[in-house]
């Protein structure tokens, strides 16, 4: 403020609790502060100083004041005193929290309320920050609330939510923070149709959103750095994973996009099954042995379990546990001029691999 | 306790046979694989055969066709039966329960194949 | 066929020493690796399968590592005992081939 020639200049800073007159102290000048409120309720203070500064404070937030200004000159009222009225700014809530909901992309916006009496309620916006396209919404409630949601927000886009105090037609200056909703991810992970070489993965995708697909990304557990993946469709929840290695672990994600946004993996774990051994060969024929022979799995084995029986045969075959180093078996004390029936199965503990048999006569 | 007595050793001249026994207890026989590994005089182990609980058979190369090796679940009792014998075939014969890894070896019996 | 070569052949050593026995595949054999131990006149023990897995009722101070084509065995305090030979067995494919042994003989 800069009123008449005679008074010194002076300025006036009003906040929420306080108002503040300011002035570049000289000799024999003083300036003395009365505030009393303009609908009484409160005492009125008066404060005298040559200081330089007089802080009224103990205001109550978003109250009309009335507060006079006099110059002192060697301590006596030489001016008329400057009378004004103002209204102290509403306090705005404080601790602020924001809350996004990645399953339902719902945001939570909650806060502590303004020590402001008798305000009208609260005012709250998202706007997207830094002009980026997207939603910009708005919610009041009323002064006794302290949180609201807001939803169809878009996810991975950064939001810049505010909360307002509001008193009739005045509000405070806004407690804001930024948050960046999240991608909901698909849920209930499960694996069917397990074989050597392929597995089906199926999921559920997030509710009330409408992704841009799903990232499936999968790679053998020891070996994680080899990651392979495929992007599927929004309208789909299931891929046929191939080319797999057998007897494998794999970890197996899968993540919601919208638009260039990805939502939190879900994982999962699994084994694909064993390969059979192939390549079954005959030799060293006799009339009561013959040599079996066959190429091992690329799965990781134990052993084998060789069951050979004559073809017509419905009595218990006989049975041999080999170690997984052997690809070859002698079968003795057959029965001469017989068709036998010779199959071969991959052991890992107790898991089995499909059979490989065989047939040949002595 | 696991205990594999071997026997049947001896000398032999080139050409002749000779049938070595294994003796088990402290285990059941029947569902084990069993192998005879051999040592000869100053020299590493060697590999000879294995038989499966089935009664399935592998051999080296070096016995092919001249040894067979067979098992008697009711006696307990493993069998290395060694024609054409060789000069080079001259070694202590150990029974090994389990093949791949040896963990219970006999003591052992000496063949000495010499005219 | 396999070959396992074990190195060094023989060494000395005293009591109290830390010993550590070589062999080397010829090619990779993964962790399918067996360490025997045999005393003269006596049968093979076994004393470590699967490269680094200890036989039930062996002393603690040996120890087996590596895999692929390189395994060593430790021994990490030599005791009177143990001197005799040793020999490194591979049983990831057929047939079983073993090194030619390493004779532990007191200095």
């Known amino acids: 403020l800069q009123p008449g020639s005679s008074i010194p200049p002076y300025n006036t800073e009003v906040t929420e609790t306080t108002i503040v007159i300011t002035w570049t102290p000289a000799p024999r000048i003083g300036f003395k502060l009365g505030v009393r409120p303009s609908q009484g309720g409160e005492a009125p203070r008066e404060v005298t100083s040559d200081s330089g500064s007089i802080v009224v404070s103990g205001l109550t937030p978003g109250v009309e004041y009335v507060y006079t200004i006099q110059v002192l000159r060697d301590g006596q009222e030489r001016d008329a005193p400057i009378v004004n009225k103002v209204v102290t700014p509403l306090s705005p809530p404080t601790n602020l929290h924001l809350e996004a909901n990645p399953d339902t992309g719902v945001l939570t916006v909650s806060w502590e309320r303004s020590t402001t009496p008798d305000i009208t309620g609260y005012r709250i916006t998202t706007t997207p920050t830094n002009g980026q396209q997207g939603n910009s919404l708005e919610e009041v409630v009323h002064a006794d609330q302290s949180s609201c949601t807001f939803d169809n927000l878009s996810p991975g886009l950064e939001y810049n939510v505010s909360v307002y105090t509001v008193k009739d037609d005045k509000e405070s200056v806004p407690i804001s923070d930024t948050i960046i909703p999240a991608v909901p991810p698909p849920t209930d992970l499960r694996f069917t149709n397990i074989g050597p070489d392929t597995m089906r993965v199926t999921w559920a995708p997030p509710p009330s959103i409408d992704l841009t697909n799903f990232l499936v990304r999968y790679s053998p557990v020891k070996n994680e750095e080899d990651v392979a993946e495929l992007s599927i469709s929004p309208s789909d929840n299931a891929v046929v994973l191939t080319n797999l290695l057998p007897g494998t672990e794999y970890v197996v994600s899968v993540s919601s996009v919208y638009e260039q946004h990805e939502s939190t993996p879900l994982r999962g774990r699994q084994k694909t099954g064993l390969d059979s051994p192939t390549g079954i060969d005959f030799s060293d024929i006799t009339a009561n042995s013959f040599t079996v022979h066959w190429i091992a799995p690329r799965a990781t084995i134990t052993g084998y379990r060789i069951r050979h029986h004559p073809e017509h045969f419905s009595g218990r075959p006989r049975e041999d546990r080999v170690p997984h180093s052997r690809n070859s078996i002698t079968l003795t004390n057959l029965t001469p001029g017989t068709e036998y029936v010779v199959s071969i199965v991959a052991l890992n503990g107790r898991e089995e691999s499909p059979l490989l048999i065989g047939q040949q006569s002595t | 306790e696991v205990q594999l007595l071997e026997s049947g050793g001896g000398l032999v001249q080139p050409g002749g046979s000779l049938r070595l026994s294994c003796a088990a207890s402290g285990f059941t026989f029947s569902s084990y694989a069993m192998s005879w590994v051999r040592q000869a005089p100053g020299k590493g182990l060697e590999w000879v055969s294995d038989?499966?609980?089935?009664?399935?058979?592998n051999y080296a190369d070096s016995v092919k066709g001249r040894f067979t090796t067979s098992r008697d679940n009711s006696k307990n009792t493993l069998y290395l039966q060694m024609n054409s014998l060789r000069a080079e075939d001259t070694a202590v014969y150990y029974c090994a329960k389990t093949a791949d890894n040896f963990d219970y070896w006999g003591q052992g019996t000496l063949v000495t194949v010499s005219s | 066929d396999i070959q396992m070569t074990q190195s060094p052949s023989s060494l000395s050593a005293s009591v109290g020493d830390r010993v550590t026995i070589t062999c080397r595949a010829s090619?990779?054999?993964?962790?399918?690796l067996n360490w025997y131990q045999q005393k003269p006149g006596k049968a093979p023990k076994l004393l470590i399968y699967?490269?680094?897995t200890l036989q039930s009722g062996v002393p603690s101070r040996f120890s087996g590592s590596g895999s692929g084509t390189d395994f060593t065995l430790t021994i990490s305090s030599l005791q009177p005992e143990d001197f005799a030979t040793y020999y490194c067995q591979q049983a990831n494919s057929a047939p079983t081939t073993f090194g030619q042994g390493t004779k532990v003989e007191i200095k």
């Open positions: 699967a490269a680094s």
């Open positions: 090619q990779s054999i993964s962790s399918y």
């Open positions: 038989i499966y609980d089935g009664g399935g058979t």
